[in-house]
């Protein structure tokens, strides 16, 4: 029950996190015009990964996409890449984790298979979260570096525009959304990995047991237990001689496909 709860919670937390990463990536407010200790302007500038926007006092907002690819700073391209990789990995992780959920039965999928899928999705969520955190942190570092360098006529800005007005940019809402979302995805991934341990059938060390039946002295050697990878067939122990006795693995109860936790 605890394993199912951990897995379910990990899935939900990761789902929220990935939704947040997608939201952050799409948001325009990665950097916003610094209003502190600056003249009050009737124009407010803010920039995202894909476009820059200007909001006037009138409420009129104009956004312009970065239609150039080569003209953009390498750091911005790197941040874009990290966020997209994070989204892709997260999306695949979500897809895998849906099938891995213990509360959902697909055919006669073994718990060992679910355990492996849970681990896979967990690792994907962890990497996804790290990508988002890294992307946001790189952008934040870029802002801090540029903050004091924003002087008149300096060639800066995400769109590579000539600045004739000293416009300094500070952290936008998207950065905080990205950090939180990345953290949630990371936590969700860790929870999935923890749940995986509880799902995996533990490997049993079998010892040879001597059985005596009908006066015959026959030794029984149980076959080695092969743990399922989740993708191959689960090779069960084969009896050497069926003399009414059961090997240890045969008396273990396996959950049927109708057992729901």
């Amino acid at each position: 029950m605890a394993v199912t709860a951990c897995q379910g919670l990990g899935f939900v937390v990761s789902l929220i996190g990935i939704a947040g990463i997608i939201a952050a990536t799409c948001m325009d407010q990665w950097s916003t015009q610094d209003l502190y200790n600056n003249p009050v302007t009737a124009v407010f500038n803010y920039q995202g990964l894909w476009r820059s926007c200007v909001r006037e006092s009138s409420g009129f907002t104009e956004c312009r996409g970065y239609f150039t690819l080569l003209g953009l700073p390498a750091m911005l391209q790197a941040v874009r890449a990290l966020m997209i990789v994070g989204i892709v990995l997260g999306a695949i992780g979500l897809l895998v984790s849906i099938f891995a959920l213990k509360c959902i039965r697909i055919g006669s999928m073994e718990d060992s298979a679910k355990a492996n899928m849970t681990l896979t999705s967990g690792i994907m969520f962890i990497v996804s979260g790290l990508c988002a955190i890294a992307g946001v942190s790189v952008f934040a570092n870029m802002l801090v570096t540029n903050f004091w360098m924003s002087t008149a006529n300096m060639y800066t800005g995400m769109g590579g525009m000539v600045q004739t007005v000293q416009t300094r940019y500070t952290f936008g809402a998207a950065l905080f959304v990205g950090w939180v979302a990345g953290g949630l995805t990371l936590i969700g991934g860790v929870m999935m990995c923890i749940a995986c341990r509880g799902l995996a059938p533990e490997e049993t060390n079998y010892k040879a047991v001597s059985y005596h039946a009908s006066g015959h002295s026959v030794a029984y050697k149980p076959g080695g237990f092969k743990a399922s990878t989740g993708f191959g067939s689960n090779t069960k122990n084969k009896k050497i001689y069926d003399g009414g006795a059961r090997t240890e693995d045969e008396v273990q109860s396996y959950p049927s496909k109708h057992d729901y936790v």
């Epitope: 015009q33 003249p39 009050v40 302007t41 009737a42 124009v43 500038n45 920039q47 820059s52 926007c53 200007v54 006037e56 006092s57 009138s58 409420g59 009129f60 104009e62 312009r64 008149a152 800005g157 525009m161 000539v162 600045q163 004739t164 007005v165 416009t167």
Partner: antibody, heavy 118, light 113 residues
């Protein structure tokens, strides 16, 4: 047709108070920022105050800050300017103007004359 | 505060001739975000409220004759009336629409010579 009509002007003694009103019609008043601009007799234009569409931002000229208060009632399609501690130099025709993209004033009222004199 | 300096104070031009009014701001009115200059030109005739002519330094307001044009960037701007008509006799004001307070220039009176 967009119309802005100012009222409330008149003769007032120095130190006195006056409340100007601007009635708006012909457009969705609640969607536009509004300004007050004044013009002393025979002089140029002087910006006085601004209020955003949802009252979230309010700005004043240094010359009136602390004495004048801008407000609006979107339900009544009205803009107001409460003027306290009036001085002789506040004598002017007061215009209300609608803010539009480019932060320009596309429509102006006909103005109301405020005379501060003893 | 941003100081807007207009020149000349008054201008007498013959009908059909070109009239040029200059406006200089103490700080750049160019916004880096959209590369637009936040400067507006108004025309005021006697006894009337001002009328919007040009915004974003060079964009003509709808209904304004094409003989009116605006140019310039940063701190230096110009309003040009390519062929002065009798109805153009008025006072012209430039306005800073970038920094609060939104200051106006002193005005330029255009008359017919």
């Amino acid at each position: 047709e967009v119309q802005l009509v100012e009222s409330g002007g008149g003769l007032v003694q120095p130190g006195g108070s006056l409340r100007l009103s601007c009635a708006a019609s012909g457009f969705t008043f609640s969607s536009f920022g509004m300004h007050w601009v004044r013009q002393a007799p025979g002089k140029g234009l002087e910006w006085v105050s601004y209020i955003s569409s949802g009252n979230s931002a309010i700005y004043y000229a240094d010359t009136v800050n602390g004495r004048f208060t801008i407000s609006r009632d979107n339900a009544k399609n009205s803009l107001y300017l409460q003027m306290n501690s009036l001085r002789a130099e506040d004598t002017a025709v007061y215009y209300c103007a609608r803010l539009r993209y480019g932060n320009s004033f596309d429509y102006w009222g006909q103005g109301t004359l405020v005379t501060v004199s003893s | 505060d941003i100081v807007m300096t207009q020149s000349p104070d008054s201008l007498a031009v013959s009908l059909g001739e070109r009239a040029t009014i200059n406006c200089k701001s103490s700080q750049s009115l160019l916004n880096s975000g959209n590369q637009k200059n936040y400067l507006t030109w108004y025309q005021q005739k006697p006894g009337q409220p001002p009328k919007l002519l040009i915004y974003w330094a060079s964009t003509r307001e709808s209904g304004v004759p094409d003989r009116f044009s605006g140019s310039g960037s940063g701190t230096d701007f110009t309003l040009t009336i390519s062929s002065l008509q009798a109805e153009d006799v008025a006072v012209y004001y430039c306005q800073n629409n970038y920094y609060y307070p939104l200051t106006f220039g002193g005005g330029t009176k255009v008359e017919i010579k």
